[in-house]
Interface confidence: low
């Protein structure tokens, strides 16, 4: 059943409906383990609802690909912003050092 159990699988049923990438807040995949012998995919929607997805479904496999692509793009964007910030800091530092020299 649809409930988290300590030391057990989380999902008894899987969601039948289509879940769109836009409505996803998070997507977690759990590999088989001693406490649960099957792959579990748990989606957290933007409205806070958590639901179990069918790992064998073609739609779900496609959703996972899109989600992973989106996550990696966001990481790249974050890294890009960090890189830009570092450049700005370097520029500011060099400007300060020039100012010090001129005074």
């Amino acid at each position: 059943t649809p409930v988290v159990r300590k030391g057990r699988c989380s999902c008894i049923s899987t969601n039948q409906g289509t879940i769109h990438l836009q409505s996803l807040k998070d997507l977690k995949q759990f590999a088989p383990s001693p406490s649960c012998e099957k792959i579990e995919i748990i989606a957290t929607l933007k409205n806070g609802v958590q639901t179990c997805l069918n790992p064998d479904s073609a739609d779900v496999k496609e959703l996972i690909k899109k989600w992973e692509k989106q996550v990696s793009q966001k990481k790249k964007q974050k890294n890009g912003k960090k890189h830009q910030k570092k450049k700005v800091l370097k520029v500011r530092k060099s400007q300060r050092s020039r100012q010090k020299k001129t005074t």
């Epitope: 649809p2 409930v3 988290v4 699988c9 989380s10 999902c11 049923s13 099957k38």
Partner: antibody, heavy 124, light 109 residues
């Protein structure tokens, strides 16, 4: 339409075995957890067993643990209940029921589809 | 193991009256895990309420559920002739274990 049809009930002697079947139609059987629930004559409902959508998890009531086995064949859209070492107190109408749609992992959606039941009588 | 107690055992009312059915748990139950069913003679049970207060598909709004912790209530605001039946509460617990209450019979006065 969504339907569950039980079969396999009958009169059986104490200590003998019986296998119940539940044929599902009108929905994607492999996406749903399934239950067996029974009702002794003139009594209330008693939950018997549950099986996850893929058969990985099974749960049993203490009264049947070690004697009954729940299983499913998703290729045949069929749920089973193997009943061994039957006792007089196992006499009941046995219903199969579908786990409620939704499968939110922090929520129990009840049993939303039920069969009409099959009668098991254990008597010498 | 959680034990559910339902009261009263029998409720005798007339059509149009309000019915209040109680379900008490021996220990605290998450409201997310409580359901109510209706059963008429010779028929399979029918899901009415899940998550303590959410109506199942096709259930009229005269049926409502409430409660939390150990005390839950099913209310039928105005009894219709077809509402005279036995009502069961049910809880889901880990392991997984599902427990039904003993039922409340609502009959015609």
């Amino acid at each position: 339409q969504v339907q569950l049809v039980e079969s396999g009930g009958g009169v059986v002697q104490p200590g003998r075995s019986l296998r119940l079947s539940c044929a599902a139609s009108g929905f994607t059987f492999s996406d749903y957890g399934m239950h067996w629930v029974r009702q002794a004559p003139g009594k209330g409902l008693e939950w018997v067993a549950v099986i996850s959508h893929n058969g990985a998890i099974k749960g049993y009531a203490d009264s049947v643990k070690g004697r009954f086995t729940i299983s499913r064949d998703n290729s045949k859209n069929t749920l089973y209940l193997q009943m061994n070492s039957l006792r007089a107190e196992d006499t009941a109408v046995y219903y199969c029921a579908r786990e409620g749609d939704g499968s939110n992992i922090y929520y129990y959606y009840g049993m939303d589809v039920w069969g009409q039941g099959t009668t098991v009588t254990v008597s010498s | 193991e959680i034990v559910l107690t339902q009261s009263p055992g029998t409720l005798s009312l007339s059509p149009g009256e309000r019915a209040t059915l109680s379900c008490r748990a021996s220990q605290s139950v998450s409201s997310s895990y409580l359901a109510w069913y209706q059963q008429k003679p010779g028929q399979a049970p029918r899901l009415l309420i899940y998550g303590a207060s959410s109506r199942a598909t096709g259930i009229p709004d005269r049926f409502s559920g409430s409660g939390s912790g150990t005390d839950f209530t099913l209310t039928i605001s105005r009894l219709e002739p077809e509402d005279f039946a036995v009502y069961y509460c049910q809880q889901y617990g880990s392991s997984p274990i599902f427990t039904f209450g003993p039922g409340t019979k609502v009959d015609i006065k």
